[in-house]
Interface confidence: medium
């Protein structure tokens, strides 16, 4: 099929990086710059994407292949393919549409962008918290209390120095 | 419309810090951010650090153990801190304003002269 | 540190004449590049960001192009009120750096 395919059709000879020009007898035509094809046999290039304003080139375009966008910096992205940049949040915090928001109680965020998420419940695990969570991290736990038999080596953890849940200001 | 205001102490001792409260009107800080940018007189000017919308800060390298920026988004007020001051901080400090659609400097300040002299 | 390299440093022309500032980035930052327009005594005006958009309110004369490490300014009449100093600034990456300036003096 694929050879039938091929004596019909001399555009399927046309390798990524070219296109099928109709107007020169359907000769392989490399693309125009600032243009791709990413699969053979194509009759028209895409043009690349341009990296402007908010976004910054992660990769620039090549005849077979598109631009990759990322965000400049204070920025991050949004979406498949980095198709929208917001502003960076500080960890512990999310973005609302009020601007960026501490994460409640109970819940955190270890990075400059996405949602506050809850804290691990440790109990569920049948364990104990170690360690205390905070806006920015999460609670570690620990083994559960049936496990730290009489005498077992087991590490004491401090008395918590603040309300637990909140990261020193 | 859109402001900036710069407010400092003109002249600075040599060792001390010092501290420059920027004022906005015209635009909310939960939304932009606001960078310093400095520039001794009659030379070019030199990028500072930025506070974004959600309060993360950013410094240059040359001056991150000095610099501290911060903000009262219920005052409307980014505050930028210089510690260990030579003769070499004196410059025009402006601030300015961070569009939504590029790491720039779409409003100025207009800038506050400061000195630092014994 | 990514050093922005502007020339000429200055330049005398007269109201009327094309102008053209080049600005070279030490490493190749997209089109991630900023002008701006300072007059003495007062604060820096954008005028270009993306290397080719003009801000808003931004006279048409004022076009600029470029990308990778090469970048370049266009007055394309100069006019009275355009007699200050440019200045390139790149933002693909930390820290923010400017150019050393390029001022335009009346012939």
């Known amino acids: 099929f694929e050879r039938t395919r091929s004596l019909q059709d001399p555009c399927s000879n046309c390798p990524a990086g070219t296109f099928c020009d109709n107007n020169r007898n359907q000769i392989c035509s490399p693309c125009p710059p600032n243009s791709f094809s990413s699969a053979g046999g194509q009759r028209t290039c895409d043009i690349c994407r341009q990296c402007k304003g908010v976004f910054r080139t992660r990769k620039e375009c090549s005849s077979t292949s598109n631009a990759e966008c990322d965000c400049t910096p204070g920025f991050h992205c949004l979406g498949a393919g980095c198709s929208m940049c917001e502003q960076d949040c500080k960890q512990g915090q999310e973005l609302t549409k009020k601007g960026c928001k501490d994460c409640c109680f109970g819940t955190f965020n270890d990075q400059k962008r996405g949602i506050c998420r809850p804290w691990t419940n440790c109990s569920l695990d049948g364990k104990s918290v170690l360690v205390n969570g905070t806006k920015e991290r999460d609670v570690v736990c620990g083994p559960s209390p049936a496990d730290l038999s009489p005498g077992a080596s087991s590490v004491t953890p401090p008395a918590p120095a603040r309300e637990p849940g909140h990261s020193p200001q | 419309q859109v402001q900036l205001q710069e407010s400092g102490p003109g002249l600075v001792k040599p060792s001390e810090t010092l501290s420059i409260t920027c004022t906005v009107s015209g635009f909310s800080l939960i939304s932009y951010g606001v960078h310093w940018v400095r520039q001794p007189p009659g030379k070019g000017l030199e990028w500072l650090g930025v506070i974004w919308s959600g309060g993360s800060t950013d410094y240059n390298p040359s001056l991150k153990s000095r610099v501290t920026i911060s903000k009262d988004t219920s005052k409307n007020q980014v505050s930028f801190k210089l510690s260990s001051l030579t003769a070499a901080d004196t410059a025009i400090y402006y601030c300015?304003?961070?569009?939504?659609?590029?790491?720039?400097?779409?409003?100025w300040g207009q800038g506050t002269l400061v000195t630092v002299s014994s | 540190d990514i050093q922005m390299t502007q020339s000429p440093s200055s330049l005398s022309a007269s109201v009327g004449d094309r102008v053209t500032i080049t600005c070279r980035a030490s490493q190749n930052v997209g089109t991630n590049v900023a002008w701006y327009q300072q007059k003495p005594g007062k604060a820096p005006k954008a005028l270009i960001y993306s290397a080719s958009y003009r801000d808003s309110g931004v006279p048409s004369r004022f076009s600029g192009s470029g990308s990778g490490t090469d970048f370049t300014l266009t007055i394309s009449s100069l006019q009275p009120e355009d007699f200050a100093t440019y200045y390139c600034?790149?933002?693909?990456?930390?820290?923010?750096?400017f150019g050393g300036g390029t001022k335009v003096e009346i012939k």
């Open positions: 300015a304003r961070n569009p939504l659609t590029a790491t720039v400097m779409d409003y």
């Open positions: 600034q790149q933002y693909n990456s930390y820290p923010l750096t």
